[in-house]
């Protein structure tokens, strides 16, 4: 996350994360400003003249929803400034002179997680936003699955699921006869060191998806799909 430090007694730290499409969510930690100060962050594009986006802080958070034509691209970068009124005058301080959204990504969770039970295995499929489809190969998923009555802390996990929107769970990984739940989260994959800078994304895991429930299939021989394992 990006952090910007204010000066003086009201020092503050901002964290701004993007869903890598049209949204930037910011959170700040600071002593409360006086009533009616209406602070805001201003995102000024360092590339597009006149490209400014206001993020009005409500409590400790604010969200910028970019216009459709400003969907984030790898080369985007912004100057972030903090604005508030004090004694009737606008005070401005610099938060980050070069905020690179692609280095501060928290994607929306995968959607439409579904299960398809066949003899001996369960196929899980999910969807991503159409805006992220070109970056499919850069998306890494983690799956958690468990018996329905168990807590998520007891779930089994499978990670390093990269560049696909499906997964096979074999019957031997599940308890036959029990209803299971699975959920998924996503982040931008950490790529090899030789990747070009404009494809270097960093950030954190998304929130978990809505879980899907399914009946564990009966155990049979392993399924080897014609396209290989994810």
């Amino acid at each position: 996350s990006v952090t910007g430090e204010g000066q003086g007694p009201r020092s503050r730290t901002f964290t701004c994360l993007t869903n890598n499409i049209l949204r930037i969510d910011c959170h700040w930690s600071a002593p409360e400003l006086g009533q009616g100060s209406s602070p805001w962050l201003l995102f000024t594009s360092n590339q597009a003249p006149g490209g400014t986006h206001k993020c009005i802080l409500r409590g400790s958070e604010c969200t910028v929803v970019l216009p459709p034509e400003a969907v984030l691209v790898p080369s985007d970068n912004f100057t972030i400034t903090f604005h508030h009124c004090m004694s009737g005058r606008e005070q401005v301080s610099l938060v980050d002179p070069e905020y690179l959204p692609r280095r501060h990504v928290k994607l929306d969770p995968p959607s439409d997680l579904q299960s398809n039970i066949s003899s001996g295995h369960c196929i899980l499929t999910w969807s991503i936003s159409p805006a992220l489809e070109p970056m499919t190969t850069l998306l890494s998923y983690e799956l958690a699955f468990k018996k329905q009555e168990e807590a998520w802390e007891q779930a089994q996990h499978r990670d390093h699921i990269v560049g696909v929107t499906w997964l096979i769970l074999e019957a031997f990984e599940l308890d036959p006869g029990f209803i299971h739940e699975a959920r998924l989260r996503v982040q931008m994959a950490t790529l090899e060191d030789d990747v070009v800078e404009e494809e270097r994304y960093t950030g954190q895991w998304s929130e978990w998806s809505q879980p899907v429930c399914f009946q564990a299939p009966q155990r049979q021989g392993p399924l080897i799909p014609p396209w290989g394992w994810p």
Epitope: P68, V71, V73, S75, P134, V196, E198
Partner: nanobody, 125 residues
């Protein structure tokens, strides 16, 4: 930053063919939908054709359907516009554009963040 350079324009007789190329810098080319637009003298810039990031979807203006074909080669960072059965009314400066498509359609100029300088196509009768 994606930079686009068009080539392949020129003078051709009606009924002839031309192939325009648009070379893009930067490996992020594969993330972008690509479009061709044109601007005739005294007219506004208009949509010609577009192709999705992986070439899976193509779109054409009604005026060029069946005559023009858009394609791309992500290994070469290049998008092409094959123009057949050219007409005098196809005379214009042709621009290549790149953008991440989302919510706005591929024919909308606001969809595109990066633009080339253009290449002149003149069709004589």
């Amino acid at each position: 930053q994606v930079q686009l350079v068009e080539s392949g324009g020129g003078l051709v007789q009606a009924g002839g063919s031309l192939r325009l190329s648009c070379a893009a810098s930067g490996r992020s080319f594969k993330f972008y939908g690509m479009g061709w637009f044109r601007q005739a003298p005294g007219k506004e810039r208009e949509f010609v054709a577009a192709i999705s990031y992986n070439g899976g979807s193509t779109y054409y203006a009604d005026s060029v359907k069946g005559r023009f074909t858009i394609s791309r080669d992500n290994a070469k960072n290049t998008v092409y516009l094959q123009m057949n059965s050219l007409k005098p009314e196809d005379t214009a400066v042709y621009y290549c554009a790149a953008g991440r498509w989302y919510k706005l359609g591929p024919s909308e100029q606001r969809t595109y963040r990066y633009w080339g300088q253009g290449t002149q196509v003149t069709v004589s009768s």
